[in-house]
Interface confidence: low
């Protein structure tokens, strides 16, 4: 991997071990503008796998909402509005990190957390193992 | 919102005002298993709108490795195996949570940041703005 | 080997409830839609209900639809089937059906491989 | 809803006679069409999926065919332990359905 010289400015590290702490500051740089994900787009309406999206909600995770998207069909939407059993609608999933209050109900400690979330749907097509 | 009581086994917190600044472990609880998102499903190759995998490296970002969908066409694949221009091919993005070292290079000091992910592509209708 | 054991049929009122349990093995049970068939005396099949292997969605007839209930608990390998408002027509065998291990359309299979001995459910006053 | 219409309802046959069932959709049910055997006080079993598949440890005397709204199973020399009842099933659109049956017996 690169090679990146230590700044002098850093501050100290309490423990050079992991699992190692580190100092995060929460206040968070946003790249983006749009935050609920109904306003973002309305794909999740006009997809030919179109999904459901449900509020998650945790005061111990940090960020405490999280929404995830359920499809509303086993199938796909075809041309004529209808329900295609013959294709699936299956969720994209995304690992994403989140901070989790360790120990628990503390405001100021944390640990990363990998979970799994539901984005949206799209449609496949199925495979068929033909078995000899 | 929902109020906790503070555990009082809690760290002490420097800093009471936004900006704050957290402990974070960085030993990850991990709820899934599986990291590599070309593993965990061919949905990117199965897909009615297919999708290619691009490998984003920060080192000064935590996670170093993010995986970003291309679209492969402007329209889906139809049941004959062509693209179908009536359709549109779309990615599902997704605001994510990182982190970013600051002051940069420092190994022990971060600040959160959203950035903005493609994870996926669907298939939507197109709306067609009809001009008087 | 898949297993399907259906339990909880019985003689019930018209107008009553009963819940049907099925314990499934040998299969990723979560993985897998799920149905109930049913089969009354000396007729044919009919599809009753589906559900998703996350249990977000279920597909009903509409004989049944508000009535009937399909649920699951993938932590204990179960479908249930809760009904209530029974009527004399649901008098049938209730047959628990699994797709086949072999078809990866991921989420969803979409035919019956796999039944289990079924239950028969008598709705009598 | 999808209706499946079987024929013959009811046929009588001899071991060694070739046996062809049909099932009409009354609308296209593209590939999405099975086949199960079914004996008295047991549950189905699937013979036939996806059209023309075999499952598993079906014999190969059993073999299906069609598209679209017209399918048949056809049985290339009945055993004496194919007697029973078959039904086709559409998985294409909700509600699923099953056709009426085919009941093969003993000439």
């Known amino acids: 991997g690169i090679t990146i010289p230590r700044n002098p400015g850093c501050p100290n590290s309490e423990d050079k071990n992991f699992p190692r702490t580190v100092m995060v500051n929460l206040n968070i740089h946003n790249r983006n503008t749009n935050t609920n994900p109904k306003r973002s787009s309305d794909y999740y309406n006009r997809s030919t796998s179109p999904w459901n999206l449900h509020r998650n909600e945790d005061p111990e995770r940090y960020p405490s909402v999280i929404w995830e998207a359920k499809c509303r069909h086993l199938g796909c939407i075809n041309a004529d509005g209808n329900v295609d059993y013959h294709m699936n609608s299956v969720p994209i999933q995304q690992e994403i990190l989140v901070l989790r209050r360790e120990p628990p109900h503390c405001p100021n400690s944390f640990r990363l957390e990998k979970i799994l979330v539901s984005v949206g749907c799209t449609c496949v097509t199925p495979i068929v193992h033909h078995v000899a | 919102g929902i109020t906790i009581p503070r555990n009082p086994g809690c760290p002490n917190s420097e800093d009471k005002n936004f900006p704050r600044t957290v402990m974070v472990n960085l030993n990850i609880h991990n709820r899934n298993t599986n990291t590599n998102p070309k593993r965990s499903s061919d949905y990117y190759n199965r897909s009615t709108s297919p999708w290619n995998l691009h490998r984003n490296e920060d080192p000064e970002r935590y996670p170093s490795v993010i995986w970003e969908a291309k679209c492969r066409h402007l329209g889906c694949i139809n049941a004959d195996g062509n693209v179908d221009y009536h359709m549109n091919s779309v990615p599902i993005q997704q605001e994510i949570l990182v982190l970013r070292r600051e002051p940069p290079h420092c190994p022990n000091s971060f600040r959160l940041e959203k950035i903005l992910v493609s994870v996926g592509c669907t298939c939507v209708t197109p709306i067609v703005h009809h001009v008087a | 080997e898949v297993q399907l054991v259906e339990s909880g049929g019985g003689l019930v009122q018209p107008g009553g409830s009963l819940r049907l349990s099925c314990a499934a093995s040998?299969?990723?049970?979560?993985?897998?839609?799920m149905a109930w068939v049913r089969q009354a005396p000396g007729k044919g099949l009919e599809w009753v209900a589906t559900i998703r292997g996350s249990g977000e969605s279920t597909y009903y007839r509409d004989s049944v639809k508000g009535r009937f209930t399909i649920s699951r608990d993938n932590a204990k390998n179960s479908l249930y089937l809760q009904m209530n408002s029974l009527r004399a027509e649901d008098t049938a065998v209730y047959y628990c059906?699994?797709?086949?291990?072999?078809?990866?359309?991921?989420?969803?299979?979409?035919?019956?491989?796999?039944w289990g001995q079924g239950t028969l459910v008598t709705v009598s006053s | 809803d999808i209706q499946l219409t079987q024929s013959p309802s009811s046929l009588s046959a001899s071991v060694g006679d070739r046996v062809t069932i049909t099932c009409r959709a009354d609308e296209s049910v593209r590939t999405l069409m099975h086949w199960y055997q079914q004996k008295p006080g047991k549950a189905p079993k699937l013979l036939i999926y996806l059209v023309s598949n075999s499952e598993i440890g079906v014999p190969d005397r059993f073999s299906g065919s069609g598209s679209g709204t017209d399918f048949r199973l056809t049985i290339s020399s009945l055993q004496p332990e194919d007697f029973a009842t078959y039904y086709c099933?559409?998985?294409?659109?909700?509600?699923?359905?099953f056709g009426q049956g085919t009941k093969v017996e003993i000439k």
């Open positions: 059906a699994s797709p086949p291990q072999y078809y990866e359309g991921s989420i969803d299979r979409l035919w019956f491989a796999h």
């Open positions: 040998g299969f990723p049970f979560s993985t897998y839609a």
């Open positions: 099933l559409q998985t294409y659109s909700y509600p699923f359905t």
